[in-house]
């Protein structure tokens, strides 16, 4: 027997459409092989209809698409506009359509019920608005309208022109009769429910004279848009569900088990738990349509999504919606890496990005995930060099090591800087990921002075201790500035203003200016890394003042040990009041907002790495 | 909460036929928008499936059967009377099991043979083929 399994019998009616699922034991060979859908002619032939390859026959052009999902060990056959001509045996299968693995699909499309002569098809989504036309002569002008909707034999009254509503469409109903001279009456039903599908009349006058036009009021739940994301990566949804609720809340909501719809965000506040960190919901357009951006995405995100607009924030019968089944790869082209990364207060981490390799050249991106109301991520540094006043001196992205990876690197760390970050890029919006940075205890492993002021025209000697672990490691001491940190040139690349004296014997690695200039003034790290991974950082700002007693200056390597002067940098991070969320870039599809999905953790040189999921950025 | 409650159940012998009903009751939602199915557990061993029939809308549905069954079954349902039927024809003794009734509101997004995946179960119904 054929492994493939898949509907036995389907069966729809004319104009309708069907999805048919096959499934298949999701080997690799399986995985990437031709999928196929055909029919089964007299002559025991089967007759490719639509293929994984991209073939659709002339018969099926416009209205059939075959989709693989490998991971899953499905593919889908959807075919739309069905007609009686459907009807028939058909195969899908694996390989090749004569000797492949196959399943027998039987389909049977049949006439849709007969409507009355005359009839109007009124077409509309669930939570839509429909207004249905109901023509009278004169001399019934005067006389009674009504609406009646046609349940088997009987008709029971929905609305008339005598005030009357009927419960089921109670505060969502309204009759309307023109002025003198128009002969058309019109009937408006607001918030459509799937229960509102049928046959209609409706009625003006009574006995022989009385007018009669029938309409068939079709509700159509919305068909799932198939979504298929990487695992670590970003989704967006877009959801634009029309004027009349865009001063109404929105909501995201996923479908569960039950067939209720649990909230995963709404305008109003609430924000399921397990999206904390991973989860925006931008500003509304004029028009009333918004996005949900998940990053960082999970096997377990998978699941169809509605979003839709109701005053509770949360989905009801009758509001309009918009459908999403999402599908989560497995077989990520993002790479794994930590999605947490520790340090300690004082210290620094460094975390490493993904982005899309075949987009080097993109804009790169770091902003900090705020969870108050919908959600916000304001930008603290961008690869053009732009950091947010607050981060001075201790924030830099750097593009190594490239090929896929950037790195941002944040230190003088304190327990505000615990939180959620985004890495961003302005090209492929899907490798948005978010990282984690927990405060752990502990203390820096590189030490340095915490306040130096040198003096114009002199030496400056700034001193920065490593612990041991490091002596293996590549040590720098770097200036930064807006745009990164500008290694400075170390001894053997001969005399310069600026050099680095390393004594490794005294773990020591120094900073020499020499004549100290005003130019000098800033912020310098010192840093260890391995080739273009970087480890932990320490910073120091140095201010520089007019000469007042002769001889050189020399901060002592006692002095290093002391903690930084809490006067040279205001530690706290203050709230970033930043416009980054309204910026275009952080929700146009084509630009802004990655997911920093499983994150490269703080110390990479660091030797006590925690685990593949979490990274230590200083080790105690 | 649906409740399922199978019948339909009991002796026959090889050759012969049942057919068993499960009627749902205590949904808030629309009976078509549940896959309704149909699996069975021999003694000693494990419940496997025989059959489901899933509604996209009202007029379009989906019939699984399993292989070791198939063109002996026919799956239906009446919406009206919130209830599922199950034909079995030419029965053989290795059909001898307890047949369960099962429902889901998971729509079109699983395979239907896993049984993980149905949320509601009824208590069963015995059916005994004998030779």
């Known amino acids: 027997k054929s492994p493939v399994f898949g509907p036995q019998e389907v069966s729809s009616v004319e104009g309708n459409s069907v999805s048919i699922k096959c499934y298949y034991p999701p080997t690799s060979v399986n995985r990437h092989t031709r999928k196929y859908w055909c029919r089964k002619g007299a002559s025991g032939r089967c007759i490719t209809l639509v293929s994984s390859e991209g073939y659709v026959s002339s018969n099926y052009a416009g209205r059939a698409n075959l989709t693989n999902f490998p991971e899953n060990g499905t593919f889908v056959v959807n075919i739309a506009q069905l007609s009686r001509d459907d009807s028939g045996h058909y195969k899908c299968g694996l390989g090749i359509n004569s000797r492949g693995l196959s399943f027998d699909v039987s389909l049977e499309v049949s006439q849709g019920p007969e409507l009355p002569n005359g009839t109007e098809v009124y077409t509309v989504d669930v939570g839509r608005t429909v207004t249905i036309k109901c023509p009278f002569k004169t001399e019934n002008a005067p006389k009674t309208k009504a609406l009646y909707k046609k349940i088997g034999q009987t008709s029971v009254l929905v609305i008339d022109s005598r005030n009357y509503v009927n419960p089921n469409y109670k505060d969502r109903i309204r009759l309307r009769i023109p002025g003198t001279g128009q002969l058309i009456f019109t009937v408006v039903i607001d918030r459509l429910r799937l229960s509102d599908h049928g046959l209609y009349l409706c009625q003006a006058g009574d006995g022989s004279n009385r007018d009669e036009k029938n309409a068939d009021l079709q509700v159509l739940e919305p068909e799932p848009e198939l979504v298929y994301e990487d695992l670590r990566g970003s989704v967006t949804f877009h959801c634009a569900l029309g004027l009349e609720v865009a001063n109404v809340a929105k909501f995201l909501c996923r479908v569960n088990s039950r067939e209720t719809c649990d909230v995963v965000i709404n305008t109003l506040g609430k924000r399921d738990s397990a999206f904390e960190g991973r989860i925006l919901l931008n500003p509304q357009d004029k028009d009333g349509s918004f996005s949900v951006v998940i990053t960082g995405l999970r096997k377990e995100d998978e699941g169809r999504y509605l979003c839709g607009a109701h005053s509770d924030g949360q989905l009801q019968e009758g509001w309009p919606i918009q459908a999403w089944q999402l599908f989560v790869n497995e077989e990520s082209t993002i790479p794994r890496s930590p999605t947490v990364v520790k340090g300690v207060a004082g210290g620094s981490v460094a975390v490493l990005c993904p982005y899309n390799p075949k987009e080097s050249q993109s804009l790169k991106y770091w902003c900090l995930w705020e969870g108050a109301q919908n959600g916000r991520c304001p930008l603290l540094v961008e690869s053009q060099g732009l950091v947010q006043e607050q981060y001075e001196g201790r924030l830099s992205l750097l593009q190594e090591p490239g090929n896929g990876t950037f790195t941002v690197i944040l230190n003088q760390l304190t327990t505000q800087d615990a939180g959620f970050y985004w890495c961003l890029t302005n090209g492929d919006t899907r490798w948005r990921t978010t990282v984690e940075i927990k405060i752990i205890e502990g203390e820096p492993n590189l030490k340095v002075p915490g306040n130096v002021t040198a003096v114009l025209g002199e030496t400056l000697n700034i001193p920065c201790h490593f612990p041991c672990k490091f002596s293996s490691y590549e040590k720098y001491w770097c200036k930064w500035s807006n745009t990164g940190c500008q290694t400075l040139p170390s001894q053997d690349e001969g005399p310069s203003e600026a050099f680095v004296n390393c004594d490794e014997n005294s773990r020591l690695v120094s900073l020499t200016l020499n004549p100290v200039t005003r130019a000098d003034e800033g912020w310098y790290w010192c840093g260890v890394k391995q080739g273009h991974f970087y480890g932990e950082t320490a910073a120091v700002y140095v201010a520089v003042e007019e000469k007042k007693v002769a001889g050189s200056r020399y901060v002592s390597p006692a002095k290093a040990d002391a903690a930084p002067d809490e006067k040279v940098l205001d530690s706290g991070v203050r709230e970033i009041e930043n416009k980054a969320i309204q910026d275009p870039r952080l929700f146009a599809e084509e630009k802004v907002v990655a997911d920093t999905g499983d994150q490269a953790g703080g110390s990479r040189a660091s030797v006590d790495s925690s685990s593949s999921e979490e990274q230590g950025g200083s080790s105690k | 909460e649906v409740q399922l409650v199978e019948s339909g159940g009991g002796l026959v012998q090889a050759g012969g036929s049942l057919r068993l009903s499960c009627a749902a009751s205590g949904s808030g939602r629309t009976f078509t928008s549940y896959t309704m199915g149909w699996f069975r557990q021999a003694p000693g061993k494990e419940r496997e499936f025989v059959s489901a029939?899933?509604?996209?809308?009202?007029?379009?549905?989906?019939?699984y059967y399993a292989d070791s069954m198939k063109g002996r079954l026919t799956i239906s349902r009446d919406n009206a009377k919130n209830t599922v039927y199950l034909q079995m024809n030419s029965l053989k003794p290795e059909d001898t099991a307890v047949y369960y009734c099962?429902?889901?509101?998971?729509?079109?997004?699983?395979?239907?043979?896993?049984?993980?995946?149905?949320?509601?179960w009824g208590q069963g119904t015995q059916v005994t083929v004998s030779s």
């Open positions: 029939l899933t509604w996209a809308d009202d007029s379009t549905y989906y019939k």
């Open positions: 099962v429902a889901t509101g998971r729509g079109l997004t699983y395979d239907p043979r896993d049984r993980r995946k149905y949320d509601y």
